[in-house]
């Protein structure tokens, strides 16, 4: 004859465990059913009764079968420098990432606890490494022969423009310029990007430059002291 | 479109049984809770329990544990309530509804129950 | 179970009035929804996560409160508001509903 299927409570056989999806309840000495994900345990088993489980309530998860006898709060609402990417619902806890233009500055175990604004390189910088979701823009000066007139999280050194007759010569924060005549190479219009990060992929390509900061290519005269070393704009 | 469609009304004796469906289309049925609602002529609304799908892990209204039993056939993405031991308390529109966590974003139109001898 | 009375139980309102009915929960709750009814059909989903308008629902109305204490309002009556509206809690099994306020156009 096959061995009969125990219905939980049931007493295990000595040295042996309980199934998969039961745990051993040490008061009632007994094998018990958990509780599936988005459920907690509203009343233990006893040795005649199995446990009895419960939704989760309004914010509250369990991701596991369990017997808890609660379940977990939901983490607070996303802050404004943060995007909901994944809703809290019974069976998962709400993940909150950061919005385009920002990296996590502290993580936690899912999502991100501290978002930060991505470094902006001011002109006469360009990015040298590209912000990620976890990790900020890397700036650096523009060499010689490169310049970047914007304030962007993402415009690298572009090289200047080559002229047959240069009327102003480049520097790292402006493109050279060229007299009347057509220069021998000219620059595609436009800044050159750096690819975007995740946390990046809704920004425009063309950061509006700040007029503070980002002269306008249209100026014919020399521009003034380089900026600091950092070369980013303060967060 | 999400819909969910109740099994007609039904007119049952006292003490039988009855069993009601509600079929779920235009979305994952595993993917949300299915909770089932009473309504009296005329009264307010009342929660019996609720089933996730996925698990087939019910629970219950205290009120009516042991009254209404609540399955479900993945197969084809019906839930079911199975009320017993009827009588004349139990006449009333009962409602299946999709539970998005903790807010009934879709109703069934409601099945009839009557219970008369 | 958590008790919820909502009131008035039935109230009237001209065109164009503002309305507000509330709904008094016996335990503190983390949220509060609403539910609208019509005679013979099935209650929608209203109001969600206190203040939170369900796809469809006209921009007139807004919900709002903590703790024991939510309402829902209409700035401005319409005829096709008339209706009964429901709250509801989730915050304490089982989950319970209010008895309803009735609203009626004058």
């Known amino acids: 004859l096959p061995a009969q299927v125990a219905f939980t409570p049931y007493a295990p056989e000595p040295g042996s465990t309980c199934r998969l999806r039961e745990y051993y309840d040490q008061t009632a000495q007994m094998c018990c059913s958990k509780c599936s994900p988005g459920q907690h345990a509203k009343v233990f088993c006893t040795k005649t009764s199995d446990t009895v489980c419960d939704s989760c309530e309004d914010s509250t998860y369990t991701q596991l079968w369990n017997w808890v006898p609660e379940c977990l709060s939901c983490g607070s609402r996303c802050s404004s420098d943060q995007v909901e990417t994944q809703a809290c619902t019974r069976e998962q806890n709400r993940i909150c990432t950061c919005r385009p233009g920002w990296y996590c500055a502290l993580s936690k175990q899912e999502g991100c606890r501290l978002c930060a604004p991505l470094r902006k390189c001011r002109p006469g910088f360009g990015v040298a490494r590209p912000g990620t979701e976890t990790s900020d823009v890397v700036c650096k000066p523009c060499a010689p022969g490169t310049f970047s007139n914007t304030t962007s999280s993402t415009d690298i050194c572009r090289p200047h423009q080559i002229c047959n007759v240069v009327a102003i010569p480049g520097n790292a924060s402006m493109d050279a310029v060229c007299t009347s005549t057509s220069p021998t190479r000219s620059m595609a219009p436009g800044a050159v990007h750096l690819p975007q990060p995740v946390s990046t992929r809704s920004q425009h390509t063309q950061p509006t430059p700040e007029p503070s900061t980002a002269p306008s290519t249209s100026f014919l005269l020399p521009m003034g002291p380089s900026p600091p070393a950092e070369g980013s704009t303060g967060d | 479109e999400v819909q969910l469609q109740q099994s007609g009304a039904e007119l049952v004796k006292p003490g039988a049984s009855v069993k009601i469906s509600c079929k779920a289309s235009?979305?994952?049925?595993?993917?949300?809770?299915m909770d089932w609602v009473k309504q009296s002529h005329g009264k307010s609304l009342e929660w019996i329990g609720d089933?996730?799908?996925?698990?087939?892990?019910?629970s219950y209204n205290q009120k009516f544990k042991g009254k209404a039993t609540l399955t479900v056939d993945k197969s084809s993405s019906t839930a079911y309530m199975e009320v017993r031991s009827l009588t004349s308390e139990d006449t009333a529109v009962f409602y299946c509804?999709?539970?998005?966590?903790?807010?009934?974003?879709?109703w069934g139109a409601g099945t009839t129950v009557t219970v008369s001898s | 179970e958590n008790v919820l009375t909502q009131s008035p139980a039935i109230m009237s309102a001209s065109l164009g009035e503002k309305v507000t009915m509330s709904c008094r929960a016996s335990?503190?709750?983390?949220?509060m929804y609403w539910y609208q009814q019509k005679s013979d059909a099935s209650p929608k989903l209203w109001i969600y996560?206190?203040?939170n308008l369900a796809p469809g629902v006209p921009a007139r109305f807004s919900g709002s409160g903590s703790g024991n204490s939510y309402s829902l309002t209409i700035s401005s009556m319409e005829g096709e508001d008339a209706a009964t509206y429901y709250c509801?809690?989730?915050?304490?099994?089982?989950?319970?509903f209010g008895g309803g306020t009735k609203l009626e156009l004058k």
């Open positions: 509804a999709r539970d998005k966590g903790w807010y009934f974003d879709v």
């Open positions: 235009g979305y994952t049925f595993t993917d949300y809770n």
């Open positions: 335990s503190s709750v983390k949220n």
């Open positions: 996560y206190t203040s």
């Open positions: 089933i996730n799908p996925n698990y087939e892990s019910t």
């Open positions: 509801q809690q989730f915050t304490s099994s089982p989950y319970t």
